[in-house]
């Protein structure tokens, strides 16, 4: 039985042209994280954080994605097309995979509020 839980930044909004931090946190498990995958709503991989090899940012996102903080991801120069779901997948021994979901809404408005509260989906 998998005992861990993934906490994520939940539903967040940010300004067009701005940046946002996508963050997942695995807790309540002794499992060892060997890799974290970050995917976009269309299932395309943005980045991988491998325990041995470190970060790999996929070419299509190299200009707009920065690794970190921690196992999280920073998305920069946001466009309206960035609106949608993002998933973190933690590969852990011996528990298996844990998956977290974040919904990002990119707003035209200059009063866009970037909420970064942690919540368990």
């Amino acid at each position: 039985m998998m005992t861990g839980t993934i906490e994520t930044t939940g539903n967040i909004s940010a300004k067009k042209g701005g940046s946002v931090i996508l963050q997942c946190h695995l807790s309540s498990t002794m499992a060892q994280v060997t890799q974290v995958n970050w995917e976009q709503h269309d299932h395309s991989l943005l980045a991988i954080r491998n325990a041995e090899l470190g970060w790999h940012i996929y070419p299509a996102f190299k200009d707009r994605v920065a690794p970190g903080p921690g196992l999280g991801l920073t998305l920069q120069s946001l466009t309206m097309n960035d609106t949608g779901e993002y998933f973190c997948t933690y590969h852990t021994y011996p528990d298996g995979t844990y998956r977290g979901r974040i919904f990002l809404e990119v707003l035209e408005s200059s009063v866009a509020e970037h909420s970064a509260r942690f919540q368990i989906p």
Epitope: M1, M2, M30, A31, Q32, V33, T34, Q35, N50, A51, E52, H91, T92, Y93, P94, D95, G96, T97
Partner: antibody, heavy 122, light 106 residues
Framework: QVQLVQSGSELKKPGASVKVSCKAS????????MNWVRQAPGQGLEWMGW????????TYAQGFTGRFVFSLDTSVSTAYLQISSLKAEDTAVYYC???????????????WGQGTTVTVSS | DIRLTQSPSFLSASVGDRVTITCRAS??????LAWYQQKPGKAPKLLIY???TLQSGVPSRFSGSGSGTEFTLTISSLQPEDFATYYC????????FGGGTKVEIK
Amino acid sequence: QVQLVQSGSELKKPGASVKVSCKASGYTFTSYPMNWVRQAPGQGLEWMGWINTNTGNPTYAQGFTGRFVFSLDTSVSTAYLQISSLKAEDTAVYYCARVGGFTVPEYAFDIWGQGTTVTVSS
Amino acid sequence: DIRLTQSPSFLSASVGDRVTITCRASQGISSYLAWYQQKPGKAPKLLIYAASTLQSGVPSRFSGSGSGTEFTLTISSLQPEDFATYYCGQVMRYPAFGGGTKVEIK
């Protein structure tokens, strides 16, 4: 090359303690979980548990709690297995084994130490 | 806990024979199964992981198949160096090994 080198054979009396070492080389020690496996004479392989090489947290399989302790010294890339209050039935070959692969389907014990024979006899 | 049952426990075969070993899991484990070879006095060696992926350096006469609860290891043409004991193993949740299959010379 990637390898695990274990300490030599031990002959111990009942009630004594033993500490087996497993030194890793050729890879980043803290990137891969480490397991311990026991093989009694003429028997199969028995998983004893594992240690998280990032945090040092050990997890013990049923039957291996109490007298068995897993530990690490990451500064020398070494895992340890200590057994206290030794009994005749602890006589076995003890292996350390690394979990290879980074994604769940790839996980397997890909690198093994050569084994350490522990003999408990009066 | 997941239990792995191997069959047969012993197998007599000749060089050149096709050999098949079965491993059954007490509950579904997807493709999270590995096969190991062990020779007397030596440590086990990983042959196959993820049910069917050959470990680097392992001869192609070894193959694995199956998913869920039933898995097989096949040696297409047994060679003299293949006489050994074979174990299936799974590493998810509570890792475990099958009881082993000793492949002996007929």
